[in-house]
């Protein structure tokens, strides 16, 4: 939820592009802002989906996980698969779409009693102020009921991406949310990790634009986990 200090800035109410990779939580002190993507996405399609080989979940887009494409298939041949939506079967949290987690073999909506932190690969920092409330996020992707509300331009105040004009998303800037540009091909994005964190992100970037996924740069595959660069790339 917006008011949660921890992972509070889910970009609300935006159908993601094909293959739906979005950016993820940024760092409180990182030079490159990060972003967080909302809960289970009902718009994702896998038409013309280009398989992307992987070895771990972190190499896949936000709305993907790394696994063998066939049941009981060769574990050595793994690709990025579309995340599992609510009420779908799962074996681990990473299989479930953002805003959900794996409970008793089923993807269920994240709730207040289950902590789902996500951290960026760069630095995060805990802030000991009176707002440091632990809270999760659960986001819908329904269209806004108020379609006639003037769409915000870059920098405008917003609560969800439908408050912003085309090509912009609603993303956090410090402690509030403003309309920011959707990322273009080649721009740096932040890969999420489905791990706990007491870090506090202050900045968000938007997710990658249509037809793009946030993936590790090929020439950075050998880099250490903490410094791998992710950019918006064509599927």
């Amino acid at each position: 939820t917006l008011n949660s200090v921890l992972n509070s800035n889910a970009i609300k109410n935006l159908p993601p592009p094909l293959g739906g990779a979005a950016g993820h939580p940024g760092s409180a002190v990182s030079a490159a802002p990060g972003i967080l993507y909302p809960g289970g996405n009902k718009y994702q399609t896998i038409d013309n989906y280009q398989p992307y080989p992987c070895a771990e979940d972190e190499e896949c887009g936000t709305d993907e996980y790394c696994a063998s494409p066939t049941r009981g298939g060769d574990a050595g041949v793994q690709i990025c698969l579309a995340c599992r939506k609510r009420r779908k079967r799962c074996m681990r949290h990473a299989m479930c779409c953002p805003g959900n987690y794996c409970k008793n073999g089923i993807c269920v909506s994240s709730d207040q009693n289950h902590f789902r932190g996500e951290i960026e690969e760069t630095i995060t920092e805990s802030f000991g102020n009176d707002h440091s409330t632990l809270d999760g996020y659960s986001r819908r992707t329904t269209l806004s009921s108020k379609m006639y509300h003037t769409k915000g331009q870059e920098g405008s105040v917003c609560l969800r991406s439908s408050d912003c004009a085309s090509g912009l998303c609603c993303a956090r800037h410090f402690w509030s949310k403003i309309c920011k540009p959707v990322l273009k091909e080649g721009q740096v994005c932040t890969k999420h990790r489905r791990k706990g964190s007491h870090g506090l992100e202050i900045f968000q970037r938007c997710y990658c634009g249509e037809g793009l996924s946030c993936r590790i740069q090929k020439d950075h595959h050998q880099a250490s986990n903490s410094s791998r660069l992710h950019t918006c790339q064509r599927h």
């Epitope: 008011n3 949660s4 309309c179």
Partner: antibody, heavy 117, light 107 residues
């Protein structure tokens, strides 16, 4: 300590202009959106609009758009609510409120605007 | 706009009893509901923010529940200084909208 100090009460005539202020302290002004909320006598609260000082980006409630202007002066960490031509129906208590991740957590003490001919 | 229907408009509760205020929204707003207390001559005070999160310094007597369209603020037990108007506020989509308010009176 976060503080939002609003300007004193105003008594105006219809058609006159007015600018009320909200001077902030105790936090980094450019890091939080500032909202303006109206409360007519004995009535509920109404969100008028907000401004993010970072780029000066605003968003208005359609009900108030075009009738009021929200602005900021970053150098003095102050937010403003302005009317170019007041109406009798603008008589109300006006609050500035700081945004904290969607909620309005700190509020000014309010500025009472009286519009009477 | 998301319309918030708050009820009851007023209620009177004896000290030590439970007070319950409800807020129903015209659209699904997840858990993006906030609750405020406003005493005469004062600005609203944030009691509970999104995700049913009790704000620092607010007594645990105040609690809230709900998500989607149905929300409840509970004060249990009520104390004499809880006399005030209470408002719900949705922060899910612009424009922000408030409930009409509930006047709580302590018998």
């Amino acid at each position: 300590e976060v503080q939002l100090l609003q300007s004193a009460a105003e008594v105006k005539r219809p058609g006159e202009s007015l600018r009320i202020s909200c001077k902030t302290s105790g936090y980094s002004f450019t890091e939080n959106t500032m909202h303006w909320v109206r409360q007519m006598p004995g009535k509920e609260l109404e969100w008028m609009g907000g401004i993010n000082p970072h780029k000066g980006g605003t968003s208005y409630n359609q009900k108030f758009k075009g009738h009021v202007t929200i602005s900021v002066d970053k150098s003095s960490s102050t937010a403003y609510l302005q009317w170019s031509s007041l109406k009798a129906s603008d008589a109300a208590m006006y609050y500035c409120a700081r945004d904290w991740l969607g909620a309005m957590d700190y509020w000014g003490q309010g500025t009472l605007v009286t519009v009477s001919s | 706009d998301t319309v918030l229907t708050q009820s009851p408009a007023s209620l009177a509760v004896s000290p030590g009893q439970r007070a319950t205020i409800t807020c129903i929204t015209s659209t699904d707003i997840d858990d993006d509901m906030n609750w405020y207390q406003q005493k005469p001559g004062q600005p609203p005070k944030l009691l509970i923010s999104e995700g049913n999160t009790l704000r620092p310094g607010v007594p645990a007597r105040f609690s809230s529940s709900g998500s989607g369209t149905d929300f409840t603020l509970t004060i249990n037990p009520v104390e004499a200084n809880d006399t005030a108007n209470y408002y719900c506020l949705q922060s899910d989509n612009l424009p922000y909208t408030f409930g009409q308010g509930t006047k709580l009176e302590i018998k």
